[in-house]
Amino acid sequence: KTLVLGKEGESAELPCESSQKKITVFTWKFSDQRKILGQHGKGVLIRGGSPSQFDRFDSKKGAWEKGSFPLIINKLKMEDSQTYICELENRKEEVELWVFKVTANSDTHLLQGQSLTLTLESPPGSSPSVQCRSPRGKNIQGGKTLSVSQLELQDSGTWTCTVLQNQKKVEFKIDIVVLAFQKASSIVYKKEGEQVEFSFPLAFTVEKLTGSGELWWQAERASSSKSWITFDLKNKEVSVKRVTQDPKLQMGKKLPLHLTLPQALPQYAGSGNLTLALEAKTGKLHQEVNLVVMRATQLQKNLTCEVWGPTSPKLMLSLKLENKEAKVSKREKAVWVLNPEAGMWQCLLSDSGQVLLESNIKVLPTWSTPVQP
């Protein structure tokens, strides 16, 4: 018995070869002897039943001259798994067809952190092994059900599942979309008074995107968090539902989600959490955003530089006179210089020598007031 493996919805070719390598009479039948199709000597394909019943069955007329009389079954169904008989030159050849199906649980669009379950459906009597490879090259294998918990962004893409049965294999490709923001977290560094831009690009594209979202903000100076903005998303169009009066945020109506804050102020420095609930999906997408604000001031004989917001302890805050060595440099959120000499002073927030934020302040001779460029 020859074994042929097929995939549900696709086509399978069941072989039947003549020893004479020329056109001859042949008939394909089901195991219960019902006729499917054949050729009775006139080079014409004759079907065994009504067209609607047998429209999925065909042969390759171009191969007949070479002594090959395959049975082509299109749009395979699980119930096509059975034995087929090819009658040719007073002999019968049995071909066993096993149709397999691999499906993803409920949906192929899953939120980051959710689980993916791949299920193999196989015909009775078969004992296949299955191995699936993720887009990032991770292999998982098991029985009829394979599970991956805590899906990550890198799991988006084509999963390849190989079903092995009697040394024969059939490959399934399943496109999985992990719904997530491109970045889990981002940090924005701004001088006091500058405009602030927050962008929340999605890591996936879908034809129609509908849902609702909200940005909650925990200011460093505040005891509790506050909702800054709520919005709806319909077919990729953003419409603001409610926005706080302070700060007065602006939000773009096109994707990617984009917000602007008219100016960076110490009272806004802190952390935000943007959540997006998508229609027909359980759970929400999250992106954290952080705002660090710098202010340089001179009050009488004291030049001060301060930062507000979530800074790492390894960040260095420095005050230096332009083109000179730093006068003061500390792993703190405020530094100052008493009786600063006249000139352009720079306040720098840096991480391992890389400047993240810079604010300049001009110190005039003692009889004048300072100028902030």
Partner: antibody, heavy 119, light 107 residues
Framework: EVQLLESGGGLVQPGGSLRLSCAAS????????MSWVRQAPGKGLEWVSG????????YYADSVKGRFIISRDISKNTLYLEMNSLRAEDTAVYYC????????????WGQGTLVTVSS | AIQMTQSPSSLSASVGDRVTITCRAS??????LGWYQQKPGKAPKLLIY???SLQSGVPSRFSGSGSGTDFTLTISSLQPEDFATYYC?????????FGQGTKLEIK
């Protein structure tokens, strides 16, 4: 071919009402965002009101909020602007404009209809 | 609402000149900006969308640039038919707002 044809303009007294219509053809009206833009004599362009194609949300300039109502009749492929409590400063040519598919500007405009508010 | 400040308000130039018009937004608007040309008694015409994309059928002498808050419309070599009034429009969010316009006249 895309066509936008405004009608309904005319002379109206201050405090009066008027309804402008814009008959649209040549594109999928039901899914397109549409707007009304006006131009007072000798002045610049002013965006007045818009309606979203995807969700039917309506939007207004502060100068007309509470007095004007934008709406659409998808079965008739027609956009409307209901103008109430009209003032002299509402005197302008009113244009109906179609937004590009992905909301990047107005790619088609009507010829405009003149609304004059005067006693 | 987002304010759009367009400059200059008027400009005199000659055929063949290179002309630049600028527009500044009061808020960051990404590249959500269009440029329009209007001739007397006519409806406006879209020239540039998404700050730098040329609308179909518009001559390549028109170009747009910029992102964030500062935008520019450039006409590389003025043609007689280019003398008109030009407007920028932010379509970042509602309410949309136009710049005050730049009247381009023959010197």
């Amino acid at each position: 071919e895309v066509q936008l044809l405004e009608s309904g303009g005319g002379l109206v007294q201050p405090g009066g009402s008027l309804r402008l219509s814009c008959a649209a053809s040549g594109f999928t009206f039901s899914t397109n965002a549409m707007s009304w833009v006006r131009q007072a004599p000798g002045k610049g362009l002013e965006w007045v009101s818009g309606i979203s194609g995807s969700n039917g949300n309506t939007y207004y300039a502060d100068s007309v909020k509470g007095r004007f109502i934008i709406s659409r009749d998808i079965s008739k492929n027609t956009l409307y602007l209901e103008m109430n409590s009209l003032r002299a400063e509402d005197t302008a040519v009113y244009y109906c404009a179609k937004e590009r598919d992905n909301w990047n500007g107005f790619d088609y405009w009507g010829q405009g209809t003149l609304v004059t508010v005067s006693s | 609402a987002i304010q759009m400040t367009q400059s200059p308000s008027s400009l005199s130039a000659s055929v063949g000149d290179r002309v630049t018009i600028t527009c500044r937004a009061s808020h960051v608007i990404r590249n959500d900006l269009g440029w329009y040309q209007q001739k007397p008694g006519k409806a406006p015409k879209l020239l540039i969308y998404a700050a730098s994309s040329l609308q179909s059928g518009v001559p390549s002498r028109f170009s747009g640039s910029g992102s964030g808050t500062d935008f520019t419309l450039t006409i590389s070599s003025l043609q007689p038919e280019d003398f008109a009034t030009y407007y920028c429009l932010q379509d970042y969010n509602y309410p949309y707002t136009f710049g005050q316009g730049t009247k381009l006249e023959i010197k």
